[in-house]
Interface confidence: low
């Protein structure tokens, strides 16, 4: 592989690494969305919530005279509970009513697939760098692109989950905004998907310069 191509690959891999960090951050944190009730009584409290793929946290926030509940960063009594994705026999008690389980299960499962693709891609990259097996960058690029697509699907599933929660009769929340974990997931999708496509482009063999050359005739890449 030429020096310029190697430089492009390294820059792309750096972008993909940033995407991996952002994807990991999005998956493990629970600030995808912040939900809040609109109206409150002066001198009481309001209950805001933030949630991710694995758990939801509600926070009892002291109120002032404003119409809104929050921000969520205000001090208050916090109560977190994990979604019971994989043990349906158990009740998730207080938070059973606050999320549409089928959505969070789907989003979490797709996120796991995304992490799986990231691990496979990273293994290919490590093997490629270690033994100069440049051809391994191609499957790596595809794995990263697939990981990005999985993150995108998770993002969309979570968007639907938030919409369902807001529209639900069972929940107090009628206002919402997407938070930093959601932003991390969106950025991860862009970096992983575009980075994967760019890596695929840079790792492909040089196209023949002349009409009479075939791919097989092209100079071997060092």
């Amino acid at each position: 592989m030429s020096q310029t191509k190697m430089l492009k690959v390294r820059v792309t891999l750096f972008c993909i690494l940033a995407g991996i960090v952002l994807a990991m951050t999005a998956v493990v944190t629970d600030h995808w969305a912040v939900l809040s009730p609109h109206m409150e009584h002066h001198n009481t409290t309001c209950e805001a919530a933030h949630f991710g793929l694995w758990r939801i946290c509600t926070k009892r926030i002291p109120m002032d005279d404003s119409k809104t509940c929050g921000p969520i960063t205000l001090p208050g009594e916090k109560n977190c509970s994990y979604f019971r994705h994989f043990n349906p026999g158990e009740s998730s008690e207080i938070f059973e009513f606050t999320t549409q389980k089928e959505y969070s299960i789907s989003a979490a499962a797709i996120a796991i697939f995304s992490l799986g693709f990231i691990i496979l891609g990273s293994l290919c990259v490590l093997l490629s760098l270690g033994k100069k097996r440049d051809y391994l960058l191609r499957p790596a690029s595809m794995f990263y692109a697939f990981a990005g697509l999985c993150i995108l699907v998770s993002v969309e599933v979570m968007r639907q989950s938030v919409k369902r929660m807001i529209d639900s009769e069972d929940t107090v929340w009628i206002e919402y905004y997407y938070s930093w974990s959601f932003a991390c997931a969106c950025a991860a999708f862009i970096l992983l998907f575009l980075g994967g496509l760019a890596l695929l482009l840079f790792s492909l063999p040089r196209m023949p310069r002349n009409p009479w050359e075939s791919c097989m005739d092209a100079e071997p890449e060092h």
Partner: antibody
Framework: QVQLVESGGGVVQPGRSLRLSCAAS????????MYWVRQTPGKGLEWVTV????????YYADSVKGRFTISRDNSKNTLFLQMNSLKTEDTAVYYC?????????????WGQGTMVTVSS | QSVLTQPPSVSGAPGQRVTISCTGS?????????VHWYQQLPGTAPRLLIS???NRPSGVPDRFSGSKSGTSASLAITGLQAEDEADYYC???????????FGGGTQLTVL
Amino acid sequence: QVQLVESGGGVVQPGRSLRLSCAASGFTFSTYGMYWVRQTPGKGLEWVTVISFDGNKKYYADSVKGRFTISRDNSKNTLFLQMNSLKTEDTAVYYCAKSSNWNYGSFDIWGQGTMVTVSS
Amino acid sequence: QSVLTQPPSVSGAPGQRVTISCTGSSSNIGAGYDVHWYQQLPGTAPRLLISYNSNRPSGVPDRFSGSKSGTSASLAITGLQAEDEADYYCQSYDRSLSGSVFGGGTQLTVL
């Protein structure tokens, strides 16, 4: 001062209609969910219906679903309850109440109540 | 039959401590929804006594206190006074009914 004043109660025959009003003052009416709660003579309290601050969300008790309609006019600080196809079991004192937290919190302000008697 | 269960009546002598229980189920109090308490003096509208399980609105004496545990809640009144004679109601939200629910009410008699 913060207060709610109901009106529109009276004696009505079964199957007829009645419209209750609740005038709010002393607080920003347009930012709070509002309820109707009733109390049958000598009995306990029963939640009837709730409406969100903007009027977009409305929920009803099963006993009145399809017959009662809650609405509000934020420009006039007034809450309404349209009661159709009234039954004798709808006889009660009807209170309007202010919600402290949408469909989930306490009723922190109550009106004095208006009596509705459904009798033939 | 009320969704939340309260004793029909309790009584106590002046200065005594009385408690009123409110028992729900996994679809209301047990699901994590808050419990609120109301006092209704004879011939008047109910008034909020305890909100969000244990919060006293301004103007409510500190003789009144509330607590919640599991699927039940309780209202405690210490230093009972003659003017406390009233009906007391608990209220919560029930997810299966998609609305608020009340207890049947407890009549407190000061002996």
